[in-house]
């Protein structure tokens, strides 16, 4: 048994460009709190019971109000450590999830609103009893600095908290076969207390309360010699008295899962699938209500007003699991065709297409202009085995993304000045010329080569070319 301890040092903008905006404002003051979830082993796969080693929620931090115009500083943190007690051995390798939550304290209807600010995850090796390990993790533009350690609760010691210690009976040395307890040199390693009645000759234990048999012995207390003859069934007889091989107790015998959890055997141990409201290795951690914020990733918590009634998390798009702890990898379904790259933006899927394809799922082959590959109202035109964009007025370039300069081609003749206009271009003609592009000379006698200037328009006035 022992405790995993997490100390948050700072949470604020990370280095580099793109500092995040402060999560709180004068209109919407807020405070932070943290949630840690621990799982044994190095598996990134979140089980349905997500925090098999345990989880903890910090206190709420001080209320913070952003100073107008100031960048987000390191935000004020809750006091104290986050502590996750573990009842069994410390696994040595573990996965963690640390979530930073914002509690908005404006005048929301129905109390404060929670939203997830940042989520970091990692996999680490850690021996119990060691020094604090420091870590820095980044989530988007945010940076979280923290330290963690695992320590054993007396009388347990060792890197896995499986050895037991007791005070020395004599000041000089420990009893026969027992070593001093590092780091508690004034104590002695205690012999493990096996299951009551476990045969001292034929049984042994690696964990308190168990009874494992030496070869040739069987039975719950290792008192039955194994005989391979006269067995009545492939698994051995139902009674141990015949001296046949009886399988020892399976890891799920007697259902170690509390609170209605269901047990399934794993290659090395067992796994409990817990009902809502309970978690931990044996579903022993209970009393979680919506007030504890059990729904990850912005899930909406419903019910669970008191510790006896279960809560339900309604997950936002892209998340699932009883605590919304599992991200649905929608890109794993490979929705983007023709070599397109998939982005799961949370609120939507986006496909980045390879050259030659377009469309929401890169389903259109651009050779046949089926895909809309032209921006700003341009239309696709086939030709020469490739597509072209015929651009709307005012736009140009390969895909009509460039704002066209209608004056670039010098369309005004005879020294006329060109002006770009929202509907095209306007030519201001030099004296003696007129027309949309100043292409017509004005006759010396004042008559024009054109029929007549429109009323109110003198020769030399700007002519709009449409």
């Amino acid at each position: 048994a022992g405790v995993f301890e997490l100390q948050i040092h700072s949470f604020g903008p990370g280095p580099g460009p793109g500092a995040p905006r402060s999560p709180c404002s004068a209109r919407l003051p807020c405070r932070l709190f943290f949630r840690v979830c621990l799982k044994p082993g190095l598996s990134e796969e979140a089980a349905e019971s997500p925090c098999a080693l345990g989880a903890a929620l910090s206190a709420r931090g001080p209320v913070y109000t952003e100073q107008p115009g100031a960048p987000a500083p390191d935000l004020p943190l809750p006091d104290g450590l986050l502590q996750v007690p573990f009842r069994d051995a410390w696994p040595g390798t573990f996965s963690f999830i640390i979530e930073t939550w914002r509690e908005e304290l404006g005048d929301q209807i129905g109390g404060p609103a929670w939203s997830l600010l940042a989520r970091v995850a990692g996999r680490r090796r850690l021996a119990a009893g060691g020094p604090w390990a420091r870590d820095i993790q980044r989530a988007g533009a945010w940076e979280l600095r923290f330290s963690y350690r695992a320590r054993c609760e007396p009388p347990a010691v060792g890197t896995a908290c499986t050895r037991l210690c007791r005070p020395r009976s004599a000041p000089s040395r420990c009893g026969p076969g027992l070593r001093p307890c590092a780091p508690l040199e004034d104590e002695c390693e205690a012999p493990l207390v096996c299951r009551a009645g476990c045969s001292p000759e034929h049984g042994f234990c690696e964990q308190p309360g168990e009874c494992r048999c030496l070869e040739g012995w069987t039975g719950p207390l290792c008192t039955v010699p194994v005989s391979t003859s006269s067995c009545l069934s492939p698994r051995g007889p139902s009674s141990a008295t015949t001296g046949c091989l009886v399988p020892g107790p399976g890891p799920c015998d007697g259902n170690p899962c509390a609170n209605g959890g269901s047990c399934s055997e794993t290659p090395r141990s067992f796994e409990c699938t817990c009902p809502r409201g309970f978690y931990g290795l044996r579903c022993e951690v209970s009393g979680v209500t919506c007030a504890d914020g059990p729904c990850f990733n912005g899930g909406l918590c419903v019910g669970g007003a008191d510790p006896d009634s279960a809560y339900i998390c309604h997950c936002p798009p892209g998340f699932q699991g009883s605590n919304c702890e599992k991200r649905v990898d929608r890109c794993s379904l490979q929705p983007c065709r023709n070599g397109g790259l998939c982005l799961d933006l949370g609120h939507a899927l986006r496909c980045r297409c390879r050259a030659g394809f377009a469309g929401p799922r890169c389903e259109h082959d651009l050779d046949d202009c089926a895909g809309r590959a032209c921006a700003n109202g341009g239309t696709c035109v086939e030709g020469g085995g490739a597509h072209r964009c015929s651009c709307a007025l005012g736009f140009g370039g390969r895909d009509c993304r460039e704002r066209a300069d209608p004056c670039a081609a010098r369309p005004c003749a005879h020294g006329g000045r060109c002006y770009a206009h929202f509907s095209g271009l306007v030519c201001a003609c030099a004296p003696g010329y007129m027309g949309a592009r100043c292409e017509f000379p004005v006759h010396p006698d004042g008559a024009s080569a054109l029929p007549a200037a429109p009323p109110g328009l003198r020769p030399g006035d700007p002519q709009r070319y449409l």
Epitope: L341, R352, R354, A355, G356, A375, R401
Partner: antibody
């Protein structure tokens, strides 16, 4: 008009890091991949990596893995390429390039290039 | 990694000549989507490269039709049908089927 404008030339000592910027105009970098390519004197062009500014995804050429970091500041419409542990053979012109809003793997628009000189 | 081998490394020609540059890849550039991601770029001294052709033979917008591309599998060709003074430059092939690899260039000089 689509344009990529890069930061000015840099002179660095071996072992140092350099960070080159690439400011985009005429389009939003969230709509496109920004690629980085370098050209050492008299050498081939080398692709270094790309960033998808929409979600920060990056991919790097194996040769530069661990030494190059490509980032983007979407609010400034600017991408950055940082190369660490510089050595003399990193002396090169570094280009940023982008594709089009409908295709991520074409090098249609290029920056003017940034000369990085590594010398003791 | 895919290797791209260009030949010749340099070439002298005159205005009006027909010029061919070849590029060979170490593995097929045919993508599972049926397209072949082979591009050609032109670079003039002191300038950034410029895209000429993509998907083997598709002309980039604004590129003169005297430039053409062909090939499949591992062998590709850039052809300039009638050299113009502004075509003297270095030409690179670039494959984007398997990440991104450039050829080492062919310098086209005036004879």
């Amino acid at each position: 008009q689509v344009q990529l404008v890069q930061s000015g030339a840099e002179v660095k000592k071996p072992g140092a890091s350099v960070k080159v910027s690439c400011k985009a105009s005429g389009f939003n970098i969230k709509d496109d991949y920004i690629h980085w390519v370098r050209q050492a004197p008299g050498q081939c062009l080398e692709w270094m990596g790309w960033i998808d500014s929409e979600n920060g995804d990056t991919e790097y050429a194996s040769k530069f893995q661990g030494r190059v970091t490509i980032t983007a500041d979407t609010s400034a419409n600017t991408a950055y390429m940082e190369l660490s542990s510089l050595r003399s053979e990193d002396t090169a012109v570094y280009y940023c390039a982008t594709s089009t809003y409908w295709s991520y793997d074409l090098f249609v628009y290029w920056g003017q290039g940034t000369l990085v000189t590594v010398s003791s | 990694d895919v290797q791209m081998t260009q030949s010749p490394s340099s070439l002298s020609a005159s205005v009006g000549d027909r010029v061919t540059i070849t590029c060979k890849s170490s593995q097929s550039l045919l993508h599972s989507n049926g397209k072949t991601y082979l591009n050609w770029l032109q670079q003039k001294p002191g300038q950034a490269p410029k895209l000429l052709l993509y998907l083997v033979s598709k002309l980039e917008s604004g590129v003169p039709s005297r430039f053409s591309g062909s090939g499949s599998g591992t062998d590709y060709t850039l052809t300039i049908s009638s050299l113009q003074p502004e075509d003297f430059a270095t030409y690179y092939c670039l494959q984007t089927t398997h990440l991104y690899t450039f050829g080492c260039g062919t310098k086209l000089e005036i004879k």
